[in-house]
């Protein structure tokens, strides 16, 4: 891995679990500054494999609610707007860090925690498996 | 909102900017047991809007690695694996949180920073032609 | 407004390679599609290829595979095209042209021009 | 590939008159995607219209297109002297081509 030199100006850490529990700051820094949401915005309408975004809200986890993307068909959609069940409309997943309050119900404490979600989803082509 | 009632056995927290300042536990909790990530490993490829992954790596970002989907082609892939011209492929793309060192360098102590990634590639039907 | 400044003529030996410039300016260089023309003398229009600067994902015309490298440095809102192993057929007047955004318009709806590069190849 | 040929080769007009510039397919082609453009001894060319029939940004209404299937018509109503030119039809779909061009000149 790579070895950073440590700045002298950070904090200190009397937490007997250090490294494992660090301090963070939530002021969210946006770094999409010059990226336009309108562009992406109804792709899921408009793709061959359309999807529809389902809200998902735990209080417990930060961010609170995440948006799941369900494929709308089993197929994809053709040029004459039919399903086409030649192909498939599979979901695009991603694996995303969220915060876990931990213990539950603490507003200061939490825990890094891995969830796998689907962002959107593409057409691809199936493997056929000719059964004997 | 939801309001929470705070648990009796939260830690507290004499750090000044609290709330905006929190403990967090990276041993990370992974929620992702019952997916095969075989399944959708090679979507990249099979996709009828095929893209390649790129590493991208920052040590004063958490996680350090991140991969970012690149659309292969600007058409769709036909039927007859042809590009298709009058079809675009489209990143998908998703705003993730992940955590920047901060003061830079320090190892105990974090901002969080929302990311714009691109996950994959979906083949959309453009709006319309020349805008005026 | 929409300008695409292509580098200045090339006169190269066959063999040799050549990379073409074109700088776009007027618009937000990473949301359109950057493609590119041939013309040579006496032929018709030719369509070599298109590029996305934002995804890097790139189409070329199958007679151009090998031939013909597409590049871009969102940076300098600059796309490059470069031609390798150069025969006297490559003698042309070569145009950057944008495309569309994928969004609005179809990533190959080209509507603004470069001014053209012409390159000769002679020995 | 599609192929695109334009008629006649070479027109011999005046300003004032009606020049009408043909472009036919090999096979057919979604008029979305067939384009008309202009372009003058030692200049770029100049896009004037896109999906068949309609006119690009800043291009006069002189200028019209039609047509669907393999047959498309690029009409200017009126010629003024700026208008001789060389004009190009061009598509895509499963390819990407261009017309050989129709040469309009001054009778």
């Known amino acids: 891995g790579i070895t950073i030199p440590r700045n002298p100006g950070c904090p200190n850490s009397e937490d007997k679990n250090f490294p494992r529990t660090v301090m963070v700051n939530l002021n969210i820094h946006n770094r999409n500054t010059n990226t336009n949401p309108k562009r992406s915005s109804d792709y899921y309408n408009r793709s061959t494999s359309p999807w529809n975004l389902h809200r998902n809200e735990d209080p417990e986890r930060y961010p609170s609610v995440i948006w799941e993307a369900k494929c709308r068909h089993l197929g994809c959609i053709n040029a004459d707007g039919n399903v086409d069940y030649h192909m498939n409309s599979v979901p695009i997943q991603q694996e995303i860090l969220v915060l876990r309050r931990e213990p539950p119900h603490c507003p200061n404490s939490f825990r890094l925690e891995k969830i796998l979600v689907s962002v959107g989803c593409t057409c691809v082509t199936p493997i056929v498996h000719h059964v004997a | 909102g939801i309001t929470i009632p705070r648990n009796p056995g939260c830690p507290n927290s004499e750090d000044k900017n609290f709330p905006r300042t929190v403990m967090v536990n990276l041993n990370i909790h992974n929620r992702n047991t019952n997916t095969n990530p075989k399944r959708s490993s090679d979507y990249y490829n099979r996709s009828t809007s095929p893209w390649n992954l790129h590493r991208n790596e920052d040590p004063e970002r958490y996680p350090s690695v991140i991969w970012e989907a690149k659309c292969r082609h600007l058409g769709c892939i036909n039927a007859d694996g042809n590009v298709d011209y009058h079809m675009n492929s489209v990143p998908i793309q998703q705003e993730i949180l992940v955590l920047r060192r901060e003061p830079p360098h320090c190892p105990n102590s974090f901002r969080l920073e929302k990311i714009l990634v691109s996950v994959g590639c979906t083949c959309v039907t453009p709006i319309v032609h020349h805008v005026a | 407004q929409v300008q695409l400044v292509q580098s200045g003529a090339e006169v190269k030996k066959p063999g040799a390679s050549v990379k073409v410039s074109c700088k776009a300016s007027g618009y937000t260089f990473n949301e359109y599609t950057m493609h590119w023309v041939k013309q040579a003398p006496g032929q018709r229009l030719e369509w070599m290829g298109g590029i996305n600067p934002n995804s890097g994902g790139v189409s070329y015309n199958q007679n151009f595979k090998g031939k013909a490298t597409l590049t871009v440095d969102t940076s300098a809102s600059t796309a490059y095209m470069e031609l390798s192993s150069l025969r006297s057929e490559d003698t042309a007047v070569y145009y950057c042209?944008?495309?569309?955004?994928?969004?609005?318009?179809?990533?190959?709806?080209?509507?603004?021009w470069g001014q053209g590069t012409t390159v000769t190849v002679s020995s | 590939e599609i192929v695109l040929t334009q008629s006649p080769g070479t027109l011999s007009l005046s300003p004032g008159e009606r020049a009408t510039l043909s472009c036919r397919a090999s096979?057919?082609?979604?008029?979305?995607?067939l384009a008309w453009y202009q372009q003058k001894p030692g200049q770029a060319p100049r896009l004037l219209i896109y999906g068949a029939s309609s006119r690009a940004t800043g291009i006069p209404d002189r200028f019209s297109g039609s047509g669907s299937g393999t047959d498309f018509t690029l009409t200017i109503s009126r010629l003024e002297p700026e208008d001789f030119a060389v004009y190009y039809c061009q598509q895509y779909g499963s390819s990407y081509t261009f017309g050989q061009g129709t040469k309009l000149e001054i009778k």
């Open positions: 042209a944008r495309g569309g955004d994928g969004y609005y318009t179809n990533y190959f709806d080209i509507d603004y």
């Open positions: 096979q057919s082609v979604s008029s979305s995607y």
